[in-house]
């Protein structure tokens, strides 16, 4: 007869049935709430392993928030109390570099990473004797899912991996440790679509538990890069999807990040939002923007969670989140991670390990200041972690948290044992905190990054810089040749210079029309299904970027394919970064670029710039002495005062913080 759980194991080529033993006086009946620490004996491939687990106290918040919708479409905010949750991390006794991410909610479920193998464990269905199945993650059948274009070097890399024993991840990270010793915190928000919710039997608790489990798995993978995953929110589209999910992965990703910027950021601060979808995209497991983790408009990804386990799905989310964190695909690069394939391999391999290339890519992001939002330790009301002094997260009731007693010896402002400020200190961390004191109001804490940005200043009574704002989308820039879009002046010449060096400039319009009408990887208006879209003549300026006067060939850690097309007496240069189908192509014209009179590029189409809803009459609203910012408030020139730039003052806006210090006006400059 078929064993109980036959269906459960249909995706496995090999597995064992085991009975774990809890190392306490009672055999299994754990008291509720769940223990902070627990140990088990488990068997795998003829060996007994002792595993030590500790509740992952950094994972979930005191006020864990879940957003859902009622039948009328009204937003419902719920704060389920899950302080004493059942999600653990740990290690295998005597196994160097081992790590574990397990839940102990209804039996043991999770991942064990040993030196040269990863195992999955889950309760055997219908067993009354605490039986579990344990299996190598390599033995999970996976439909071939891709995250990029094919690459001939993949076979070469795999062959090489089998010949020589690669160094361990710890050794790799020890070699290059310029930035990685500093812990980074990714404040993650997860959105679950309607179809996935339906697939889970419309059970909100089940969806919530599964996503917490997912976050615990992600944390166990990212910890090797000294990155902590903090789940700051979950939204379930219980009443219907709030974006259009028809079309290709690129369309859905675009729709999702637009929705995120408009509706989600204002509700809950976070660094990256990941959409979990049931619907697939013809073999593409997910898609995300590269290096955009701190971006207001593009810090997101989409991830397909169909008929696979949450353990396998975790590597997809880790991969797409990795893109947000600046990581490119490993294919064709000299990367190793101590396993046959790594998380950032384009083939959605189900790996649990990040490669040396991923560590370097992330390091580049941080060195280029692309990861500044990851430095803040989540605030008490934003971090989903059961309060615990010493976890380096400032929890509710804490004023600071410097970590372990050893780390706290180096902190002059924070009392390590109590997580309170020392008696003389006003603050212990933050952009506006120096030597345990608030920096004076008017101290610049976030400079202007482009002609479409505005600076922010400390307010004198907080350790935090004012929230980031920029000039309102649609404001003319570059002498009326372009528009501001998400804090950048988007114009063709600047994009060409980023890719092809300072002498490059936009090619004539004929180049765009000729190349982008082809509908191939070098000239297209995006991707539809499995093929490139040809650009209609009216949209050609929003397809692949075409440049001329090229004197430098780009090097971005990944060598792109460059195409040169002769056209009417000039050479049009274009580039294909071959980052894979799950990554938006940086060789395309940027969104927000002016493609005609009163028109901008959006979703590879040249559309009416009215979609930006630019509504600022600077003469009337700001009296000709300022511009409107992204909150639609006047940012005044130096010499004029907010809110309306009518009276004399020191510039700035109601959002920027004071631009001067009454005690020392020299700070203004």
């Amino acid at each position: 007869a078929a064993r109980p759980g036959f269906q459960q194991t249909s995706h496995l080529s090999s597995y064992e049935i085991i009975t774990p033993w809890r190392l306490t006086r009672e055999r299994r009946e754990a008291p509720r709430p769940y223990s902070k620490q627990v140990s088990y004996v488990i068997q795998a491939e003829g060996k007994e392993h002792i595993i030590h687990l500790e509740r992952n106290k950094d994972l979930l918040p005191e006020d864990f928030v879940v957003y859902t919708y009622n039948k009328e479409g009204t937003l419902i905010t719920d704060h389920p109390n899950i302080q004493n949750h059942c999600h653990y991390r740990g290690y295998v006794e005597g196994v160097h570099n081992s790590s574990i991410a397990l839940s102990d909610c209804f039996g043991l479920r999770g991942l064990l990473h040993l030196e040269n193998a990863s195992y999955g464990i889950e309760p055997l269905q219908n067993s009354s004797h605490f039986e579990h199945i344990i299996y190598r993650m390599d033995d999970v059948y996976k439909e071939p899912l891709k995250c990029g274009v094919s690459n001939k070097d993949i076979e070469k890399e795999t062959a090489k991996d089998e010949e020589e024993e690669p160094p361990s991840m710890t050794q790799l990270l020890r070699r290059r440790r310029a930035v990685l010793p500093q812990t980074r915190y990714v404040e993650l928000f997860i959105v679950v679509d309607k179809e996935r919710y339906d697939m889970m039997g419309r059970n909100q608790t089940a969806v919530r538990e599964e996503m917490i489990l997912l976050a615990n798995y992600l944390d166990s993978m990212y910890i090797m890069l000294n990155i902590r995953i903090v789940l700051v929110g979950l939204e379930i589209w219980t009443n219907g999807n709030l974006i259009n999910i028809v079309g290709g992965a690129g369309d859905v990703l675009g729709n999702f990040v637009q929705w995120r910027e408009k509706f989600l950021i204002t509700r809950r601060r976070h660094d990256s939002a990941q959409l979990v979808l049931k619907k697939g995209f013809g073999g593409t497991a997910g898609m995300a923007f590269v290096g955009t983790v701190c971006s207001r408009s593009h810090a997101g990804g989409i991830n397909v969670f169909g008929q696979i386990t949450v353990e396998t799905f975790a590597s997809i989310v880790a991969h797409e989140l990795g893109h947000n964190l600046g990581m490119n695909h490993d294919d064709g690069r000299d990367c190793s991670c101590g396993a046959k394939s790594c998380i950032m391999n384009s083939g959605a391999s189900g790996s649990r390990n990040f490669s040396s290339c991923s560590a370097e890519d992330f390091e580049k992001l941080t060195l280029n200041k692309g990861g500044n939002c990851l430095l803040n330790i989540p605030k008490p009301d934003e971090a989903y972690s059961a309060p615990s002094c010493g976890n380096k997260l400032v929890d509710a009731g804490e004023e600071c948290d410097c970590g372990t007693p050893k780390e706290c010896e180096l902190d002059p402002c924070c009392e390590g044992s109590t997580c309170k400020l020392k008696s003389f200190a006003e603050c212990a961390y933050g952009d506006c905190c120096k030597d345990c004191r608030f920096l004076p109001g008017g101290t610049l804490c976030r400079g202007k990054t482009s002609e479409c940005d505005v600076p922010e200043y400390c307010n004198g009574s907080s350790q935090f810089c004012q929230p980031d704002v920029f000039i309102q989308n649609g404001y003319p820039c570059q002498n009326n040749k372009a528009y501001c879009y998400n804090g950048m002046c988007q114009y063709y010449d600047a994009q060409c210079q980023v890719i092809f060096g300072s002498k490059a400039k936009a090619a004539p319009k004929d180049c765009f029309i000729e190349v982008n009408s082809k509908g191939d990887r070098f000239g297209n208006c995006g991707f539809s299904g499995n093929e490139y879209k040809k650009c209609a003549t009216g949209n050609a300026l929003c397809g692949k970027l075409q440049c001329e006067n090229v004197q430098e060939i780009p090097v971005f850690g990944i060598v792109p394919a460059i195409i040169q097309t002769p056209s009417r007496g000039t050479k049009c240069w274009g580039v294909d970064f071959q980052l894979g189908s799950d990554v938006p192509d940086p060789g395309m014209v940027n969104e927000g670029t002016k493609c005609g009179a009163g028109k901008i590029c959006r979703n590879f189409q040249c559309v009416d710039a009215s979609v930006l809803n630019y509504d600022c009459d600077v003469q009337k609203k700001c009296h000709g002495h300022g511009v409107c910012n992204s909150n639609k408030n006047c940012h005044c020139e130096n010499g004029w005062a907010p809110p309306n730039c009518e009276t004399k003052g020191y510039g700035g806006s109601v959002d920027s913080g004071p631009t001067y210090n009454e005690m020392n006006t020299a700070l203004r400059d």
Epitope: G474, G538, A597, G598, D608, S610, D615, C616
Partner: nanobody
Framework: EVQLVESGGGLVQAGGSLRLSCAAS????????MAWYRQAPRKQREFVAS???????TYADSVKGRFAISRDTAKNTVALQMNSLKPEDTAVYYC??????????????WGQGTQVTVSS
């Protein structure tokens, strides 16, 4: 200057349809971008759809696939066909005419608006 008069608003059930019309008087209708905007209570006015003189049609993401804009140059009218209406489409809808290349909300001529209410 173009004078604009909207019509066709009213009360409709969620999932229903309405057709708004905007009649323009003045001789420069054909050289104008025609657009529809809307303003819900306590919200800022927002772009809905436009049709430019070169034929470019643009929709706000929130109405894409549900609304359709069209113009009849001979009759100096622009219409907005609204299908699969949702409660959040409730607003005063305004017709706007502006010169080609203008895109900011202060530009051009505006109608008085027509109220659309979608009940659940």
């Amino acid at each position: 200057e173009v004078q604009l008069v909207e019509s066709g608003g009213g009360l409709v059930q969620a999932g229903g349809s309405l057709r708004l019309s905007c009649a323009a008087s003045g001789s420069i209708f054909s050289s104008n971008t025609m657009a529809w905007y809307r303003q819900a209570p306590r919200k800022q006015r927002e772009f809905v759809a436009s049709i430019m003189t070169d034929g470019t049609i643009t929709y706000a993401d929130s109405v894409k696939g549900r609304f359709a804009i069209s113009r009849d140059t001979a009759k100096n009218t622009v219409a907005l066909q609204m299908n699969s209406l949702k409660p959040e489409d409730t607003a005063v809808y305004y017709c706007n005419a502006r010169q080609y290349g203008e895109y900011w909300q202060a530009a051009g001529s505006w109608g008085q608006g027509t109220q659309v209410t979608v009940s659940s």
